[in-house]
Structures are given as structure tokens and as C-alpha cells.
């Protein structure tokens, strides 16, 4: 008894669903009584399939309401394990074991990334100095590097910061300042570049005609 | 601190029976699959059983399949060896092991041998 | 059943020396390969799970690479204490199937 998971790895994005599978021979029709299916996620219990029927007593409480066995698929050989609205915290190794007539049991990896689409900006000037303060702010997963450019695409050195933000779902903020002595209309891009998978989001940043009073730093994003 | 504590092993004449306990703490015992795996006298490490966490499922290795059962009590947390029709070639040291993503824990061994 | 092969069956080194053992799946296990390191008289210890992950509580001198097939154990900077034997071991299907160990003797 052999089962197969046509895909080891999955890679998807935050929120969205995503659907594993592992093939399990089945000749003839389906016995559901005498099926096990599990789908384990390092120590907890996503999904349970004992006796004919999903047992959620199990479920580990950050899988409820989630995770999914279709049984449709089921009586194809298919235990295909659904996560809806996936989480940072979904990422990892899981195992799906399945036990019919013989056993075994195969691990697939969850990669979950969180792109830095939403780029929030903000353009403020010292009066004493002309100096212009470029801001670049968003959320993602995993770490991000913050390329700042000018009109020419020649490559100006901004000070980035990390932090973890206090959303539950601890998704990275990236701040990016740039300061830079600038004239109207001038044109400036900040790319927020995930290195390990060379994705790239980029907001275009204009000088102002008039002056931007400088804003107090106690501000949130 | 995780423990795992084997116990049971010994001396027993070929077509003997012997049962091998394993005392577990220092973890939730029910959350995990659990396993046996053995090493002949100067061999390798050979994988001999498994039992998923609810005790509902058990796999064996082929050389020790209709002789070996594996049990678990999760109210004791505690797992068994059931060792029947013994043979030369089952003279081993005996661990059992707690399988997460790997064996990640393993307990001190018991020796089993097997002769006459 | 997937065979794992190790090598070599044995090496020596010195103290301070980089030291690399290879294993080899007979079929495709991704990257769920494990490796453990024993000491005479001991219990087998977890270094190395899923390939590269380094188990809590190990050494960073242990490292670990490979996919598919083609596995590397690597000590960047041999230790007194990590004279041993060392096993590798696939996880990703019954019957779970160690490597027939490589031990690391003192030059």
C-alpha cells in the first residue's frame, strides 16, 4: 500500500486557499468504514477521518471552521486536505497518513507569502535644511529590501527599519526613509524586492510644487 | 524535559514471547505517533513499528510483521512492544522513539536477546 | 521500499577538520531527510530534520543540504565530542529506512 502526493510543495499567498492532495489506490468502490485519514501539521491535528466521518473533537483550534476533506474526492482515492483564507502561521510541514487495508503516509511543505502590494507614502520637508524625507511603508511576508531610485534608475541609499506588526497575523511592516535634497516634480521609486523570490512592488513618489511641512513622528500607519 | 524510559528486554529462548514497555513524559503523549526502531549488536538502526497518535492505526516492517504488535495506552502514557515467535535475529537493543517531523526523541534501549 | 545508501562507511579526521557525509535515496524523498549522530552505548540524537533544519539545542557547525536524491551532512569545524557515528534517515513513507552509518574516527 503506496500513497503518492502529486505535489510536495505548495506555495501561496496570504488569505487565499489552498488545496493538498495525496492519492491512495482504491480498486472497486470505496469502503469508507475501513479508511483513516489523517492530516497532521507538525503536533496538531488539521483533520481526522475515522469510521466513515470527519472527527473534529481533535482539530487543533487554529485549523476550525478551515480545513476541509471533501469526501467526494475521497471515494476517488483523493484525500485532498482544503485550507481556506490561509494564515502566515499555516506555513510549515504537514503529513497526511492514511490507513486502508495497508498504511502510509507522505509530508508536503506550505509556503505562505505575504506581498508588499499596499504601499503607503509620504512625502515631508525640513524648512531648515530644503531636505526632503521620502517614506515608504507596507505589510508582507517574508523579509523585504527597500530599493530606493530616482528618475535616472540610479540607486539612492535609504534607511530601512523591520518590525513585526501587532496584527495577530504578524505580518512584517517595512519602513523606508529616504532623505534627499529635491526639486519639484521630481521623481522618485521605492521597491519593496522579497529577495528569495525576486518579487517586486514599486510606488512612484513626486515632489510637491509646494512645500510639505514636516509631520510629528508620533504618527501610525 | 522530554523522557522516554524502555523497559522489558532480556534474555528469552528462540519462539519465546517478551513485552517491551515504554514510560513517556514531559510532552502530551496522545498528540504524537510514536514508534519502535532497533540496532542489532555492531549494525545499523532498523525501524520496527509505528502507532498513530490515537492508537486507531499500526505498521510494521515486513521482518517482524503477524510476530510484533505495538500498543499504546494514552491514559498511561505509556507504549508496548508485543514480541512473539522470537528468533536469533531479533537479538537487538530496542528503543522507541517519539516521530514528529523526524524520530526526534529517543529513550535509552532495552536489550532483547534472543538465544538458546 | 526506498534504500538509502551513506558514504563513506567510515572516515578519519582531526580536530578543526570540515567534514562532509553524503547520502543517497534510491528514489526521490524530496526533502524529508533526517540525520542523526550516536555515540557508543547511547540513543541515536536528532541533528538535522527535513533536510537543512537544525534540530533545537544542536551545534551550528552542523549543517545540512540536499533534495531528491542527493543528500550532504557537513561539520564545518570537527569537535572532540563529535566523534560518532552518523545516520541518515528518509521520512516520507513506510517502511522508514535508515543509511547504513558513517563513522567519524580521530586521525
Known amino acids: 500500500f503506496t500513497i503518492t502526493a502529486p505535489k510536495d510543495l505548495y506555495v501561496v499567498e496570504y488569505g487565499s486557499n489552498v488545496t493538498m492532495e495525496c492519492r491512495f489506490p482504491v480498486e472497486q468502490k470505496l469502503d469508507l468504514l475501513a479508511l483513516v485519514v489523517y492530516w497532521e501539521k507538525e503536533d496538531k491535528e488539521v483533520i481526522q477521518f475515522v469510521e466513515g466521518e470527519e472527527d473534529l473533537k481533535p482539530q487543533h483550534s487554529s485549523f476550525r471552521g478551515r480545513a476541509f476533506l471533501p469526501k467526494d474526492q475521497l471515494l476517488k482515492g483523493n484525500a485532498v486536505l482544503q485550507i481556506t483564507d490561509v494564515k502566515l502561521q499555516d506555513a510549515g510541514v504537514y503529513c497526511c497518513m492514511i490507513s486502508y487495508g495497508g498504511a502510509d503516509y507522505k509530508r508536503i511543505t506550505l509556503k505562505v507569502n505575504a506581498p508588499y502590494r499596499k504601499i503607503n507614502q509620504r512625502i515631508s520637508m525640513d524648512p531648515a535644511t530644503s531636505e526632503h524625507e521620502l517614506m515608504c511603508q507596507a505589510e508582507g511576508y517574508p523579509e523585504a529590501e527597500v530599493i530606493w531610485t530616482n528618475s535616472d534608475h540610479q540607486s539612492l541609499s535609504g534607511e530601512t527599519t523591520v518590525t513585526t506588526s501587532q496584527t495577530e497575523e504578524k505580518l512584517l511592516n517595512v519602513t523606508s526613509v529616504l532623505r534627499v535634497n529635491a526639486t519639484a516634480n521630481d521623481v522618485f521609486h521605492c521597491t519593496f524586492w522579497r529577495v528569495h523570490s525576486g518579487e517586486n512592488h514599486t510606488a512612484e513618489l513626486i515632489i510637491p510644487e509646494l512645500p510639505v511641512p514636516r509631520l510629528p513622528h508620533n504618527r501610525t500607519h | 524535559e522530554v523522557q522516554l524510559l524502555e523497559s522489558g528486554g532480556g534474555l528469552v529462548q528462540p519462539g519465546g514471547s517478551l513485552r517491551l514497555s515504554c514510560a513517556a513524559s514531559?510532552?502530551?503523549?496522545?498528540?504524537?505517533?510514536m514508534s519502535w526502531v532497533r540496532q542489532a549488536p555492531g549494525k545499523g538502526l532498523e525501524w520496527v513499528s509505528s502507532?498513530?497518535?490515537?492508537?486507531?492505526?499500526?505498521v510494521y516492517a515486513d521482518s517482524v510483521k503477524g510476530r510484533f504488535t505495538i500498543s499504546r495506552d494514552n491514559s498511561k502514557n505509556t507504549l508496548y512492544l508485543q514480541m512473539n515467535s522470537l528468533r536469533a535475529e531479533d537479538t537487538a537493543v530496542y528503543y522507541c522513539?517519539?516521530?514528529?517531523?523526524?524520530?526526534?526523541?529517543w529513550g535509552q534501549g532495552t536489550l532483547v536477546t534472543v538465544s538458546s | 521500499d526506498i534504500q538509502m545508501t551513506q558514504s563513506p562507511s567510515s572516515l578519519s579526521a582531526s580536530v578543526g577538520d570540515r567534514v562532509t557525509i553524503t547520502c543517497r535515496a534510491s528514489?526521490?524523498?524530496?526533502?524529508?531527510l533526517n540525520w542523526y549522530q550516536q555515540k557508543p552505548g547511547k540513543a541515536p540524537k536528532l541533528l538535522i530534520y527535513?533536510?537543512?533544519s537544525l534540530q533545537s539545542g544542536v551545534p551550528s557547525r552542523f549543517s545540512g543540504s540536499g533534495s531528491g536524491t542527493d543528500f550532504t551532512l557537513t561539520i564545518s569545524s570537527l569537535q572532540p565530542e563529535d566523534f560518532a557515528t552518523y545516520y541518515c534517515?528518509?521520512?516520507?513513507?513506510?517502511?522508514?529506512?535508515f543509511g547504513g552509518g558513517t563513522k567519524v574516527e580521530i586521525k
Open positions: 527535513a533536510a537543512s
Open positions: 502507532i498513530w497518535r490515537n492508537g486507531i492505526v499500526t
Open positions: 534517515q528518509q521520512d516520507n513513507g513506510y517502511p522508514s529506512t
Open positions: 522513539a517519539k516521530w514528529s517531523a523526524a524520530f526526534d526523541y
Open positions: 528514489q526521490s524523498i524530496s526533502s524529508y
Open positions: 514531559g510532552f502530551t503523549f496522545s498528540s504524537y505517533a
